[in-house]
């Protein structure tokens, strides 16, 4: 049976899928589709890679990891309840019946009502350099923005607030990291 993954409405959903390239840069085609993996293909394709690059994608669907190293995990931006369902990751390894196929179940929950709905915007505006994301390029991370002048009290207060917030869950679930100091 498929593995289940969860996200809230308005969040980004993350569906993991990996393979190990035979050699660096020796990529195999991969497709992501909505619906369970059929016998040969990917269902309703939302993203596809070839031996070199992402060659097809639809809005809101992207690869946040380094697909050149075999991380072909799918990120779905700003999910709605309609995004719930089965997704197919198919690694189209050349040869006779070598495909690896994975069915992943995405469950979207209604958004929780939080007392501090502006926290995420405020935090990223004040501390843009604290967010690092996995990138497409050879570098493992991309640093966003530059560090503004802040004091330790601000950092401490915001870090405590962040620990219990939905943002902390968002960041942890999406694979982003928070660096303080």
């Amino acid at each position: 049976s498929e593995v289940e993954y969860r996200a809230e409405v308005g969040q980004n959903a993350y569906l993991p899928c990996f393979y190990t390239p035979a050699a660096p840069g020796n990529l195999v085609p991969v497709c992501w589709g909505k619906g369970a993996c059929p016998v040969f293909e990917c269902g309703n394709v939302v993203l596809r890679t070839d031996e070199r690059d992402v060659n097809y994608w639809t809005s809101r669907y992207w690869l946040n990891g380094d697909f050149r190293k075999g991380d072909v995990s799918l990120t779905i931006e700003n999910v709605t309840l309609a995004d719930s369902g089965i997704y197919c990751c198919r690694i189209q390894i050349p040869g006779i019946m070598n495909d690896e196929k994975f069915n992943l179940k995405l469950v979207i929950k209604p958004a929780k009502v939080t007392p501090a709905p502006t926290l995420q915007r405020d935090f990223t505006a004040a501390f843009p350099r604290m967010l690092t994301t996995r990138g497409h390029g050879p570098a493992e991370t991309q640093t966003l923005g530059s560090l503004p002048d802040i004091n330790l009290t601000q950092i401490s207060t915001l870090a405590n607030e962040l620990r219990d917030s939905r943002l902390a869950n968002d960041l942890r679930d999406s694979g982003a990291t928070i660096r303080i100091g």
């Epitope: 195999v28 059929p38 040969f40 293909e41 269902g43 394709v45 019946m97 495909d99």
Partner: antibody, heavy 119, light 111 residues
Framework: EVQLVESGGGLVQPGGSLRLSCAAS????????MSWVRQAPGKGLEWVAA???????YYPDSVKGRFTISRDNAKNTLYLQMNSLRAEDTAVYYC?????????????WGQGTLVTVSS | EIVMTQSPATLSVSPGERATLSCRAS??????????MQWYQQKPGQAPRLLIY???NVESGIPARFSGSGSGTEFTLTISSLQSEDFAVYYC?????????FGGGTKVEIK
């Protein structure tokens, strides 16, 4: 208009080889899984080989190791290389397009090409 | 492999009558709530033509008198009122597993 046109059939001796071609037009060939399906005279349909859009290959045991399916997306052409042919391989060979997003069933077929294996 | 068995081998029907063709799979062809079963029509000297996919979905351009039903291992193709152009051989096919397999066919002939 989707068109699939097979060629390359003919008479061949047992143990011989033949290469079938299927020229595709009217659709984005590279996006589709493609198959070969055969039909012996007076008999039913038998799936022979498939190649996915990503190039993965599939065969039934009856032809595995003897037949090779391949595709040239630049030429919009599907191929079937048949080696070590046997009398029981005598059939009309159809090129068939797998349904988009699935590939496991066939929404367009060629007219077929006859392969006769006989001494 | 999944073995597909069609019955009857030959069905004699008068024009205007209803025809019911059966197909049984040796194991279930259900997959995430969908029956991966198709039906094709083949006339002499012609390539097969897709009629029904996923057990009950009528292919574009196919007359409404053709319908499919069933789930699991038992499937039916129904032609509600046979027209002269419907006399042909009909095949079922499963697309759950490799090897893809077809039934032996049912010949629908004029009574």
């Amino acid at each position: 208009e989707v068109q699939l046109v097979e060629s390359g059939g003919g008479l061949v001796q047992p143990g011989g080889s033949l290469r079938l071609s299927c020229a595709a037009s009217g659709f984005t060939f590279s996006r589709y899984a493609m198959s070969w399906v055969r039909q012996a005279p007076g008999k039913g349909l038998e799936w022979v080989a498939a190649i996915s859009s990503g190039g993965s290959l599939y065969y039934p045991d009856s032809v595995k190791g003897r037949f090779t399916i391949s595709r040239d997306n630049a030429k919009n052409t599907l191929y079937l290389q048949m080696n070590s042919l046997r009398a029981e391989d005598t059939a009309v060979y159809y090129c068939a397009r797998g349904r988009e997003a699935d590939g496991g069933y066939f929404d367009y077929w060629g007219q077929g090409t006859l392969v006769t294996v006989s001494s | 492999e999944i073995v597909m068995t069609q019955s009857p081998a030959t069905l004699s029907v008068s024009p205007g009558e209803r025809a019911t063709l059966s197909c049984r799979a040796s194991e279930s062809v259900e997959y995430y709530g969908t029956s991966l079963m198709q039906w094709y029509q083949q006339k002499p000297g012609q390539a097969p033509r897709l009629l029904i996919y996923a057990a009950s979905n009528v292919e574009s351009g196919i007359p409404a008198r053709f319908s499919g039903s069933g789930s699991g291992t038992e499937f039916t193709l129904t032609i509600s009122s046979l027209q002269s152009e419907d006399f042909a051989v009909y095949y079922c096919q499963q697309s759950l597993k490799v090897p893809l397999t077809f039934g032996g066919g049912t010949k629908v002939e004029i009574k």
